[in-house]
């Protein structure tokens, strides 16, 4: 009888499979920054190294009674979830524990920083195989803790963090808000967000995916073969750390970007009831529950993309929002979204050698989001072509004029503030394949890429009747790289990608007064990578 | 994801009144002071002094020593608890909040963050 959480994240064909690196040499090591742990527990005995690292604050209260089994409870359970013989995700994985949380489960940002530095030092002194760092803790937003995570991630370490148990936006907490960290929210046996008393799992754009985190069976520090169930985003993060350890033991050269993209791509989609989250967070929160992905050898050279939302721009007239991809990823398209519909569009620009997705608020707008589509495109060479706004009444066309470059995304940015004087932009796939077409007062940006075997096509879907949103999906084998809304005269809120679905949103008040002749169109650019083929545009 | 969220950033770029020292007066603080937005989670009295990314090993130690020296001139004892070399340049210090203005004016300082609690999740 396998615990529900393991059944959920490990597909049947993986259950008995042992993960071995091809040459058997590179041993994955997981570092756990948590409470002290009971190393003699049968679940983890022989596979855990309790380091001498200890950086914790004093326990509160004069009458606090230090009881070993209570002090070890949180850490022991998580160590068991990661690598326990029976109830572990990555059975047998080597684990190193660092004590950064006291017997009450409290630590400090400084203690955590010193712990992360200890890992970096260990890595420098004795370089080993792939390293995974599990951070089952959260504090308020900390610039330095996020920066330390970024520095460690850039040395090749994979960091996995709890989203937090505050039923709040994970971006307000650290290390959950660090982009270089894989941030994990918690779901229950019904794949619903975990409620913990009056609180529950954190959510929002800083969460990468969810994993089992309610009533999770794991090692109990009460005795050396005892088990207990615990709940929280720590348990969820431990599942993902275990999955990552298994992925790395099969394929030690996988990078953070590849790991994250594969976790997202192979997760279970659309099973979470998003109504649990606050309305303004629903569109930003990923509807993804982690599962162990197959190896890259089994899945071939798929084009993998993910959607990255910016922080909200704020309501000021010139407020901009910026969304960034990870250093290894290519920004293949940029779109924008505003709840009020008052936005001046989006564009791609280079900042410090990296292309970023920007969106601009409009006068009277409540603010915008920039929405980047970030993809792994091996040996890609991408560039942006833009055309300034045309004179009134004229269309602006931009296409990819370099040989073997294909269009992966379009962005449109309006110079004028007045929303009523301009028609919205449009993609025209039938008459002008592979072109971005903008209408009056719009600067048009085309994202053009060359990569071996990359081919793309436009897919459109329009709805004439009243509808809050129009969607178009890329078919199996194709990956959504660009998503735009092509409306009639009505006001649109913008467009964004959800997995392989392009969602175009229309203003509520615009629904009723639209005539059937003014279709709102969702236009998707769908691409695939066929390494043997030449780059091409498919009509 | 890395934009500063619900976070307190305070500019403490106050010119030093009691400092007659040339090098101190010459350096106007552009560094910022940051602390946790949740008051109950703050640990006043302990600060992480973060230096510019290119700061060399020796300069980190010199900056920490300089802060101790200048604090001593004002009759304050400060304790350097840890020096960060490997992940980022900086140091952890136990000191009175009265010294933040002084610390922010030190060369190489990018920002100072007040220590705060983290919790098991």
């Amino acid at each position: 009888s396998i615990p529900w959480n393991l059944e959920r994240i490990i597909p049947a064909w993986h259950q008995t499979e042992e993960d071995r690196s091809p040459d058997g040499s590179s041993q994955v090591e997981v570092y756990l920054l948590d409470t002290s742990i009971q190393g003699a527990h049968r679940e983890i005995e022989g596979r855990v190294t309790i380091t001498d690292f200890n950086s914790v604050p004093e326990e509160d209260g004069t009458r606090f009674h230090r009881q070993a089994s209570k002090c070890d409870s949180h850490g022991t359970h998580l160590a068991g979830v990661v690598s326990g013989r029976d109830a572990g995700v990555a059975k047998g994985t080597s684990l190193h524990s660092l004590r950064v949380l006291n017997c009450q489960g409290k630590g400090t940002v400084s203690g955590t920083l010193i712990g992360l530095e200890f890992i970096r030092k260990s890595q420098l002194i004795q370089p080993s195989g792939p390293l995974v760092v599990l951070l089952p803790l959260a504090g308020g937003y900390s610039r330095i803790l996020n920066a330390a995570c970024r520095h460690l991630a850039r040395t090749g370490v994979v960091l996995v963090a709890a989203a937090g148990n505050f039923r709040d936006d994970a971006c307000l907490y650290s290390p959950a808000s660090a982009p270089e960290v894989i941030t994990v929210g918690a779901t229950n046996a019904q794949d619903q967000p975990v409620t913990l008393g009056t609180l529950g799992t954190n959510f929002g754009r800083c969460v990468d995916l969810f994993a089992p985190g309610k009533d999770i069976i794991g090692a109990s520090s009460d005795c050396s073969t005892c088990f207990m169930s615990q709940s929280g985003t720590s348990q969820a993060a431990a599942h993902v750390a275990g999955i990552v350890a298994r992925m790395l033991s099969r394929e030690p050269t996988l990078t953070l970007a590849e790991l994250r993209q594969r976790l997202i791509h192979f997760s279970t989609k659309d099973v979470i009831n998003m109504a649990w989250f606050p309305e303004d967070q629903q569109v930003l929160t990923p509807n993804l529950v982690a599962t162990l992905p197959p190896s890259t050898h089994e899945t071939g050279g798929q084009l993998l993309c993910r959607t990255v939302w910016s922080a909200h721009s704020g309501p000021t007239r010139t407020a901009t929002a910026t969304a960034r991809c990870a250093p290894e990823e290519e920004l293949l398209s940029c779109s924008s979204f505003s709840r009020s519909g008052r936005r001046r569009g989006d564009w791609i620009e280079a900042i410090g050698g990296q292309q970023v997705c920007k969106a601009l608020n409009a006068f009277g707008g409540e603010g915008v989001y920039a929405v980047a589509r970030c993809c792994l495109v091996p040996r890609a060479n991408c560039s942006i072509h833009n055309t300034p706004a045309a004179r009134a009444g004229l269309e602006t066309h931009v296409h990819c004029h370099q040989k073997d470059h294909v269009l992966t995304g379009c962005s449109f940015h309006w110079e004028v503030e007045d929303l009523s004087v301009r028609r919205q932009p449009a993609l025209r796939s039938r008459r002008q394949p592979g072109q971005c077409v903008g209408h009056q007062a719009a600067s048009v940006y085309a994202s053009c890429c060359h990569a071996p075997g990359l081919e793309c096509k436009i897919k459109e879907h329009g709805i004439s009747g009243p509808s809050e949103q129009v969607t178009v999906a890329c078919e199996a084998g194709w990956t959504l790289t660009g998503c735009n809304v092509l409306p009639g005269a009505s006001l649109t809120l913008g467009a964004y990608s959800v997995d392989n679905l392009c969602v175009a949103r229309v203003h509520d008040t615009a629904r009723a007064d639209r005539t059937s002749g003014e279709a709102t169109v969702a236009a998707a650019i769908c691409c695939r990578s066929r390494p043997s083929a030449k780059a091409s545009w498919v009509q | 994801q890395d934009e500063d969220g619900d976070y307190e950033e305070l500019m403490l770029a106050l010119p030093s009144q009691e400092d007659g020292l040339a090098d101190e007066a010459a350096h106007v603080a552009t560094a910022t002071f940051r602390r946790c937005s949740k008051e109950a989670w703050r640990l006043p009295g302990t600060y992480i002094v973060v230096l510019m990314e290119e700061t060399q090993r020796l300069q980190i130690e010199q900056t920490a020593h300089r802060l101790q020296t200048r604090a001593a001139r004002r009759g304050y004892v400060i304790k350097v608890l840890h020096i960060f070399y490997d992940l980022f340049p900086g140091f952890l210090v136990k000191m009175s909040s009265d010294l933040l203005g002084l610390a922010l004016k030190l060369p190489h300082v990018e920002y100072i963050e007040e220590d705060s609690f983290v919790f098991a999740q």
């Epitope: 003699a40 029976d86 069976i217 009460d222 005795c223 050396s224 073969t225 005892c226 | -």
Partner: antibody
Framework: QVQLLESGGGLVQPGGSLRLSCKAS????????IYWVRQAPGKGLEWIGW????????RYNQKFQSKATISRDNSKNTLYLQMNSLRAEDTAVYYC???????????WGQGTLVTVSS | EIVLTQSPATLSLSPGERATITCRAS??????LNWYQQKPGQAPRLLIY???NRATGIPARFSGSGSGTDFTLTISSLEPEDFAVYYC??????????FGGGTKVEIK
């Protein structure tokens, strides 16, 4: 080879007490905990308590907390079970067995019968 | 506290037949369950440790399986000396040592 030999059983008056011994041989005495288990006639096995000879630490089944005391003499490689305030329902075969905590009880003594009767 | 429920309480079989005894734990115990055999007038003897591993000197006809909460002890072909009482055992926090109620395998 590993051996555990119990002694000290016999007939005891109700309210009386007795001390059982368990002599260990054939292994490193301090490396394994020793468990005392009893079995009433025709009944199942019931754990009384254990001792870690290495540090002398003991743990008891709550039911026996005030009745039993476990001790050891490392110089003799011997463990003891002291039972007080005995009643008729304490009539049973008493076994000592060795184990590392969380592992199986891999070696057992032959048992010693304690009869509480007037 | 974990409760171990053994079934059946008594099993009446003939030599050469297959015996199957089950032990159900009230909570998840992983694979940390042991089986013992006790013949009349003798001390218990370890048969199977950690759910499926045969102890030293135990014949191959004895096998254990299961994990989590449901466990099985199987004797593939009963020999005359196998007629005895069988106990399952796990560890817990309080009390730390828990035994099942026992299953008596008797000659039919």
């Amino acid at each position: 080879q590993v051996q555990l030999l119990e002694s000290g059983g016999g007939l005891v008056q109700p309210g009386g007490s007795l001390r059982l011994s368990c002599k260990a041989s054939g292994y490193t005495f301090s490396s394994y905990s020793i468990y005392w288990v009893r079995q009433a006639p025709g009944k199942g096995l019931e754990w009384i308590g254990w001792i870690d000879p290495g540090n002398g630490g003991t743990r008891y089944n709550q039911k026996f907390q005030s009745k039993a005391t476990i001790s050891r003499d490392n110089s003799k490689n011997t463990l003891y079970l002291q039972m007080n305030s005995l009643r008729a329902e304490d009539t049973a075969v008493y076994y000592c067995a060795r184990a590392r905590v969380g592992y199986s009880l891999d070696y057992w003594g032959q048992g010693t019968l304690v009869t509480v009767s007037s | 506290e974990i409760v171990l429920t053994q079934s059946p309480a008594t099993l009446s079989l003939s030599p050469g037949e297959r015996a199957t005894i089950t032990c159900r734990a009230s909570q998840y115990v992983g694979s940390y369950l042991n089986w013992y055999q006790q013949k009349p007038g003798q001390a218990p003897r370890l048969l199977i440790y950690d759910a499926s591993n045969r102890a030293t000197g135990i014949p191959a006809r004895f096998s254990g399986s299961g994990s989590g909460t449901d466990f099985t002890l199987t004797i593939s072909s009963l020999e005359p000396e196998d007629f005895a009482v069988y106990y399952c055992q796990v560890w817990d926090s309080s009390p730390p040592v828990v035994f099942g109620g026992g299953t008596k395998v008797e000659i039919k």
